[in-house]
């Protein structure tokens, strides 16, 4: 007899998600030296642990306190860069400028970058059909708890400039409801981070707009000086000259704005 | 062959301030983080002030609120404003250029250096 089983709103399960999790840990672990003691048989059960046999609809940050621990990893605090639906070139910045650091090139977050993944009440399953839409089902479901967890710690983390890359060509530049904007704000510490400053990435060839004047830039100001923490705008109006002149700032034809 | 040239140290009384200019050439320096560092005798050095590429800036806390950091990138310059000055900031003071965009206070991160300003404040 078939068991009844939830049906959730968002998809299910990356398949082969057991599978991928440890790949990409034993991948990671290989290529960064300074990981090379993590055991990733252990994050996989850490990982595992947090939302197996749990409701899909009741995790908590506790609940992935383990992996956490696990995972734990010191990334240079002045070299952290941030982003808010803009992910691709946050990282092909970031292969660019390699001492700089987003959240998914330490182990967790490459860990889950992509993944879905969610359990049963009372079964040792992962639910391969459906999983918890953030919106129309709850909002503390494994993955979102997982992202929110991760991007807390690597808020809190960061000190002296911290820069956050955000997209020019969304209504809302900067999104409120963002992980960004109701997680990451809210959790750069005041007493180590003097400055916040925002890339807005024009996505229009002939964009000469100054979107540092935007109103959803302007309120990023707002909640960022009230925490006693500067703010600085700036435009990057040919994204892909940007990563040109990251790569080789002394080209000439960097010496024009990007 | 890149060179920075530091200029307008001296001798002045504590409160007083002092305005530090280094001038870079051989190459430019618009999409670098340039920075002030110093060192007193018998110490290392030390971080006081940095600007990245778009223009963000980055204090040690204890000239926080009394020092600020400028560039003219048309000019290839870089400017300390020194205010408020004590005897404790007594030193060398040395302009420094990274070959990346942002600033960082760590020393071993700049690739250019230049041959550096005295700076005495007497109480």
């Known amino acids: 007899v078939p068991r009844w089983r939830q049906q959730w709103s968002g998809p299910g399960t990356t398949k082969r998600f057991p599978e991928t999790v440890l790949a990409r840990c034993v991948k990671y672990t290989e290529i960064h030296p300074e990981m090379r003691h993590v055991d990733c048989q252990s994050v996989w059960d850490a990982f595992k642990g947090a939302f197996i046999s749990k409701h899909p609809c009741n995790i908590t940050e506790e609940d992935y306190q383990p992996l956490m621990k696990l995972g734990t990893q010191t990334v240079p605090c002045n070299k952290i860069l941030l982003w808010s639906r803009i992910k691709d070139l946050a990282h092909q910045f970031t292969q660019v400028q390699r001492d700089m650091f987003t959240l998914e090139d330490t182990l967790l977050g490459y860990l889950a970058d992509d993944l879905t993944w969610c359990g049963e009440f009372n079964t040792s399953k992962i639910n391969y059909q459906s999983c918890p839409d953030w919106r129309k089902d709850c909002s503390n479901n494994p993955v979102s708890v997982f992202w929110k967890t991760v991007s807390r710690r690597f808020a809190e983390a960061a000190c002296d400039v911290v820069h956050v890359m955000l997209n020019g060509s969304r209504s809302k530049i900067f999104d409120k409801n963002s992980t960004f904007g109701s997680v990451e704000v809210h959790n750069l510490q005041p007493e180590k981070v003097q400055t916040l400053e925002a890339w807005v990435i024009h996505g229009g060839r002939e964009d000469s707009r100054d979107l540092c004047q935007d109103p959803t830039i302007k309120e990023l100001e707002s909640i960022i000086s009230k925490r006693n923490i500067q703010f600085s705008c700036k435009n990057i109006y040919r994204p892909d000259k940007f990563l040109q002149c990251v790569k080789n700032p002394e080209d000439s034809s960097c010496t024009s704005e990007i | 062959e890149v060179q920075l040239l530091e200029s307008g140290g001296g001798l002045v009384q504590a409160g007083a301030s002092l305005r530090l200019s280094c001038a870079a050439s051989?190459?430019?320096?618009?999409?670098?983080?340039m920075g002030w560092f110093c060192q007193a005798p018998g110490k290392g050095r030390e971080f006081v002030a940095g600007?990245?590429?778009?223009?963000?800036?980055l204090y040690a806390d204890s000239v926080k609120g009394r020092f600020t950091i400028s560039r003219d990138n048309a000019k290839n310059m870089v400017y300390l404003q020194m205010n408020s000055l004590a005897p404790e900031d007594t030193a060398v003071y040395f302009c420094?250029?990274?070959?990346?965009?942002?600033?960082?206070?760590?020393?071993?991160?700049?690739?250019?250096w230049g041959q550096g300003t005295q700076v005495t404040v007497s109480s």
């Open positions: 420094a250029a990274r070959s990346r965009m942002f600033v960082t206070r760590s020393p071993d991160e700049y690739d250019y």
């Open positions: 051989g190459r430019t320096f618009r999409n670098s983080a």
């Open positions: 600007m990245s590429w778009s223009g963000s800036t």
